[in-house]
C-alpha cells in the first residue's frame, strides 16, 4: 500500500514510496522537505502560507544557517523550517492511527539538521529503520540554531528562544496534520539527544505544548542541564552587536539593528572555543534557551507540573562527559600525556564557582578519593570523564527524573544508562559510551549499513528500537509490537531503577541507584554550601574584548568538534554531533 498525494493544511504533498524488498509487500512512504513554518530574522516563526498544486516532497531541504566546521564560513540557509516524514506501510491497506515519533536533533543549539550528518546519502537521522522496525511514523525537522535561533537581549525587544518556538511549530504542525499521513495525533512522542534532549525536556515544560505531547524521551540532556539555559543573554547579545557594528546601550535599538544585519554576519560573529580556556567549554555556549517569561515562563525546576501526564524516558551515556573532558583537559585522550591534580582541580573549580573555594575543595575531595589507592593515569583520566559526565548529564538527569516522578499523575517514568562502548579505535581501552554514541543505534545504522557493524551492535540497536518504539506506542517500553530482551521496570524515587543498555541485556541489566554517593553529594552536601558569587550561570566576563572566560575568544581561535559537513563521514566518529 502507498499513500500517494496527501492533503495537509498547506496543500497537497507527494513523497516517494520505497519498497522494503524486491518481492514487494512492505514499504515506507517518505516525505522530505515539507514546510511547517516561515520566519524572519530574529522573529518568532509564523504559519506557512501554503501552496497550490502538489508539493513534491522528495529531497531534504538545507539546514538552518550555521557556521561550518572551521567557523570561518556558513552553510545552510535562513529559509529552513521544513520537516520530513517516514510512514511504514503494509502490503494491503495504508497505515492508520500509528504512533508518531518526532525527533529533535542536538548540536549545542549551535549546529545540526533534521537529516543529520551524511555519508554517501546515508543520513544519520534517516527515520526508515525506526519506522519500519517499530511500525511508527517518524518525523524529523529543522529548527534555527546559533545566534539566529537563540540570541536574546533578555527583554521583549529580543526575547530569544526562536529555535524552541520553531520546534513547537513543528510539533503543532504534526498534531494538526499527521492524521492525513496515517498517524495518531493523540499519540505523539518527542525524542532527542543532547541539546535536542534538553529541547525535548523544555518542550514538555512549556505551557505552549499543553495537550500536544503524550510521551518524551531525552537522551543525554535535560532542561536542568547547566548548559541548557542562558542566565546572562544580554552580555552575549552585546558581544555580537559590537562585532557587527550595532548599538549596545539601548536594547530596542540594538534589536532593530541586529534584525536587519546580514544573518551570515550574525552567525559568524560568534565562535565557540576549543582550545583550553579559563572555564570549562560549556560556559561558552552563548546562544541557548532563556527563561523568557512566556515560552519558558519560569525556571525549569518550577515547571514540572506541566509534565504530570507525559510519559518520560530519560538517560545518559556512561561516558557522556568524555567529549567535553577532551576539550577541557586535553591530556585525557592522549596516552603520552598526563593529567595532573592541578588540571582536575582547575576543571572542578570551573564547574563549582558558585560555591567558591569550599565547593571546589569538597568536590575535588570526593572525586579524588580513589586516587590514594589507585593513582594511575587511567584512573585519574576516568575520574575527569566521570566528573564531567556527572555535572553535565547524570546529576541534572537524575534530578529531572525525580521531579517528573514526584509530579506525575498518569505519567510513567523510566531511566536508562547506555554503556555499549564507543567503537572509535583511537580511544583509550577504558573508554565507554561517549556523548552521541547512542544515536547510531537508535537510528538503526547497524542494520542500514551492516558492513560497518558487528552482530553485538545490531543486538544493541534492535533492543533500543524495540524499547523506544514500544514506549511510543503504549507508554511502556515493554509493551508493543516488538519483543524486548528483558523487562524494563519504571523508575522509582526509592530505588532509582534504571536499565543498563549493553550488548547483552538480561534481567541483571535492571539496576538501582546509579552513582548514589555522588548524587547525594551534589544534591545534599554541595547544595547546602553557601553561594559566594550568586548564580554560577550569571558569571559575567569583562566588558572589554579580552580573552577572559566566558568572553568568546577572538576570531582566530580553534574550534570545537562539530558535526561533519554534508558530504563527510557519519555517526561512528567522535564528536559527530557535538553536544
Amino acid at each position: 500500500a502507498k499513500l500517494g498525494a496527501v492533503y495537509t493544511e498547506g496543500g497537497f504533498v507527494e513523497g516517494v514510496n520505497k519498497k522494503l524488498s524486491l518481492l514487494g509487500g512492505d514499504s515506507v512512504d517518505i516525505f522530505k522537505g515539507i514546510p511547517f513554518a516561515t520566519a524572519k530574522t530574529l522573529e518568532n516563526p509564523q504559519r506557512h502560507p501554503g501552496w497550490q498544486g502538489t508539493l513534491k516532497a522528495t529531497n531534504f531541504k538545507k539546514r538552518c544557517l550555521q557556521a561550518t566546521i572551521t567557523q570561518d564560513n556558513t552553510y545552510g540557509q535562513e529559509d529552513c523550517l521544513y520537516l520530513n516524514i517516514w510512514v511504514p506501510q503494509g502490503r494491503k491497506q495504508v497505515s492508520h492511527n500509528l504512533p508518531v515519533m518526532v525527533w529533535i536533533y542536538g548540536g549545542a543549539f549551535l549546529m545540526g539538521s533534521g537529516q543529520g550528518a551524511n555519508f554517501l546519502k546515508n543520513y544519520l537521522y534517516d527515520g526508515e529503520e525506526i519506522a519500519t522496525r517499530g511500525n511508527v511514523i517518524v518525523v524529523t525537522f529543522n529548527y534555527r540554531v546559533g545566534p539566529l535561533g537563540f540570541l536574546s537581549t533578555g527583554d521583549a525587544n529580543l526575547p530569544g528562544n526562536f529555535g524552541l518556538r520553531d520546534q513547537h511549530m513543528a510539533i503543532a504542525w504534526v498534531k494538526r496534520n499527521i492524521a492525513a499521513f496515517g498517524g495518531d495525533p493523540d499519540n505523539i512522542t518527542i525524542f532527542g539527544e543532547s541539546a535536542g534532549a534538553a529541547s525535548v525536556s523544555l518542550q514538555t515544560l512549556s505551557p505552549y505544548n499543553k495537550g500536544l505531547i503524550r510521551r518524551a524521551i531525552s537522551q543525554s540532556g535535560m532542561a536542568l542541564s547547566p548548559w541548557a539555559i542562558q542566565k546572562n543573554p544580554l552580555f552575549w547579545a552585546k558581544t555580537i552587536a559590537k562585532k557587527v557594528g550595532c548599538p549596545t546601550e539601548d536594547t530596542g535599538k540594538m534589536a532593530a539593528c541586529l534584525k536587519i544585519t546580514d544573518p551570515r554576519a550574525l552567525t559568524l560573529a560568534y565562535k565557540l572555543p576549543v582550545k583550553k580556556q579559563e572555564y570549562p567549554v560549556v560556559h561558552y555556549l552563548a546562544f541557548i534557551p532563556v527563561i523568557d517569561g512566556d515560552f519558558i515562563p519560569d525556571d525549569p525546576i518550577n515547571l514540572y507540573n506541566n509534565t504530570a501526564d507525559i510519559d518520560y524516558i530519560a538517560g545518559i551515556n556512561n561516558m557522556d562527559g568524555h567529549l567535553f573532558a577532551t576539550i577541557d583537559v586535553p591530556a585525557v585522550d592522549k596516552t603520552k600525556q598526563t593529567v595532573t591534580e592541578e588540571d582536575f582541580y582547575r576543571l572542578v573549580s570551573g564547574h563549582t564557582v558558585a560555591k567558591g573555594l569550599k565547593g571546589a575543595q569538597a568536590t575535588f575531595d570526593i572525586y579524588t578519593e580513589s586516587w590514594a589507592q589507585d593513582p594511575s593515569q587511567e584512573n585519574m583520566k576516568k575520574t575527569v570523564v566521570a566528573f564531567e559526565t556527572d555535572v553535565l548529564f547524570l546529576i541534572p538527569t537524575e534530578i529531572a527524573l525525580a521531579q517528573h516522578k514526584a509530579h506525575a499523575k498518569s505519567a510513567k517514568t523510566y531511566s536508562y544508562l547506555f554503556s555499549h562502548p564507543s567503537r572509535m579505535p583511537i580511544y583509550p581501552k577504558w573508554m565507554g559510551a561517549d556523548h552521541a554514541d547512542d544515536l547510531q543505534y537508535v537510528f538503526g545504522k547497524p542494520f542500514a549499513t551492516p558492513l560497518g557493524y558487528r552482530p553485538q551492535d545490531r543486538a544493541v540497536s534492535k533492543a533500543m528500537i524495540a524499547y523506544w518504539t514500544n514506549f511510543a506506542r503504549s507508554g511502556d517500553p515493554n509493551m508493543g509490537n516488538s519483543p524486548v530482551p528483558t523487562h524494563w521496570y519504571p523508575y522509582t524515587l526509592e530505588n532509582g531503577n534504571y536499565l543498563d543498555i549493553t550488548k547483552t541485556i538480561t534481567s541483571a541489566s535492571m539496576k538501582e541507584h546509579l552513582r548514589e554517593k555522588f548524587l547525594k553529594f551534589w544534591a545534599v552536601t554541595f547544595e547546602v554550601l553557601p553561594t559566594v558569587t550568586g548564580d554560577q550561570d550569571t558569571l559575567t566576563p569583562p566588558e572589554d574584548d579580552s580573552e577572559v572566560a566566558p568572553d568568546p575568544p577572538s576570531d582566530d581561535s580553534q574550534v570545537v568538534p562539530v558535526p561533519p559537513t554534508d558530504d563527510s563521514v557519519e555517526a561512528q566518529m567522535p564528536a559527530t554531533i557535538g553536544f
Epitope: 500517494g4 498525494a5 492533503y7 493544511e9 496543500g11 494538526r176 496534520n177
Partner: antibody, heavy 119, light 105 residues
C-alpha cells in the same frame, strides 16, 4: 473575473449516484485547488474533499471516503464530484469552492447545486 | 477532526450596534477564516488568516485571535450585514463552525 458555474439541480432515488459539475473560468484552472462543500437544508457547511486540478490528486473527508469521487477535465476546465449510494440525508446544496491563495480560505464559490434524494 | 464551536448560535441586534461572534477550536489551529452567507446564496469570504480582509470587504468587519479562541467583530451593523456567519479552520481535514445567525432586533 473568477467564475465557477455549477450544473443544475438533480433529483435522485436512494441508492443512486449523482455527478455534479463545476466549470471554472477567469483564471488558470490548474493553478488552484477546488473543494466541495455541502449544506443540508437549514444546516451548516460541511467539507467533503478537495482536488488538485493539475495532477488530479484528491483528499476526501473521512465521512465520505469510499462514496465520493472527485475528478477533473483540464480541457474544459471542469471539476466533477460524484457521490454514490445516495441516502435521504444526502439531500443538500453542493458547492464547489476555489482556494483564495496558498493554503488559504475558500475565496470563490459556485452558485450551488441542489441534490434531492427522495423515493 | 478539529471541532469548531461558535457562540452565540443566534443573535438579535440593531443597525449601528457593535456585534461580536466568537469561535473556539477543540485544539490549537494555525489560522481561522470567517464567511458570511445570506439565504439562498453561496457563502462569501469575509476574513481570512484570523484578521485579514479580502479586497471589497468593508473595514467595519475585523477579526482577531490565535490558538484556540477567535473573534469576529462588526463595529457598526449595517442593514446588509444581517446574515449567517461561519468560522472555518483549514487543516488536513477542514471543518466549519455550526454558524451564528444574526437577525434584526
Amino acid at each position: 473575473q473568477v467564475q465557477l458555474v455549477q450544473s443544475g439541480a438533480e433529483v435522485k432515488k436512494p441508492g443512486a449516484s449523482v455527478k455534479v459539475s463545476c466549470k471554472a473560468s477567469g483564471y488558470t484552472f490548474t493553478s488552484y485547488n477546488m473543494h466541495w462543500v455541502r449544506q443540508a437544508p437549514g444546516q451548516g457547511l460541511e467539507w467533503m474533499g478537495v482536488i488538485n486540478p493539475s495532477d488530479g490528486a484528491t483528499s476526501y473527508a473521512q465521512k465520505f471516503q469510499g462514496r465520493v469521487t472527485m475528478t477533473r477535465d483540464t480541457s474544459t476546465s471542469t471539476v466533477y464530484m460524484e457521490l454514490s449510494s445516495l441516502r435521504s440525508e444526502d439531500t443538500a446544496v453542493y458547492y464547489c469552492a476555489r482556494d483564495y491563495y496558498g493554503s488559504s480560505p475558500l475565496g470563490y464559490w459556485g452558485q450551488g447545486t441542489l441534490v434531492t434524494v427522495s423515493s | 477532526d478539529i471541532q469548531m464551536t461558535q457562540s452565540p448560535s443566534s443573535l438579535s441586534a440593531s443597525v449601528g450596534d457593535r456585534v461580536t461572534i466568537t469561535c473556539s477550536a477543540s485544539q490549537s489551529i494555525s489560522y481561522l477564516n470567517w464567511y458570511q452567507q445570506k439565504p439562498g446564496k453561496a457563502p462569501k469570504l469575509l476574513i481570512y488568516a484570523a484578521s485579514r480582509l479580502p479586497s471589497g470587504v468593508p473595514s467595519r468587519f475585523s477579526g482577531s485571535g490565535s490558538g484556540t479562541d477567535f473573534t469576529l467583530t462588526i463595529s457598526s451593523l449595517q442593514p446588509e450585514d444581517f446574515a449567517t456567519y461561519y468560522c472555518h479552520q483549514r487543516s488536513s481535514y477542514p471543518t466549519f463552525g455550526q454558524g451564528t445567525k444574526l437577525e434584526i432586533k
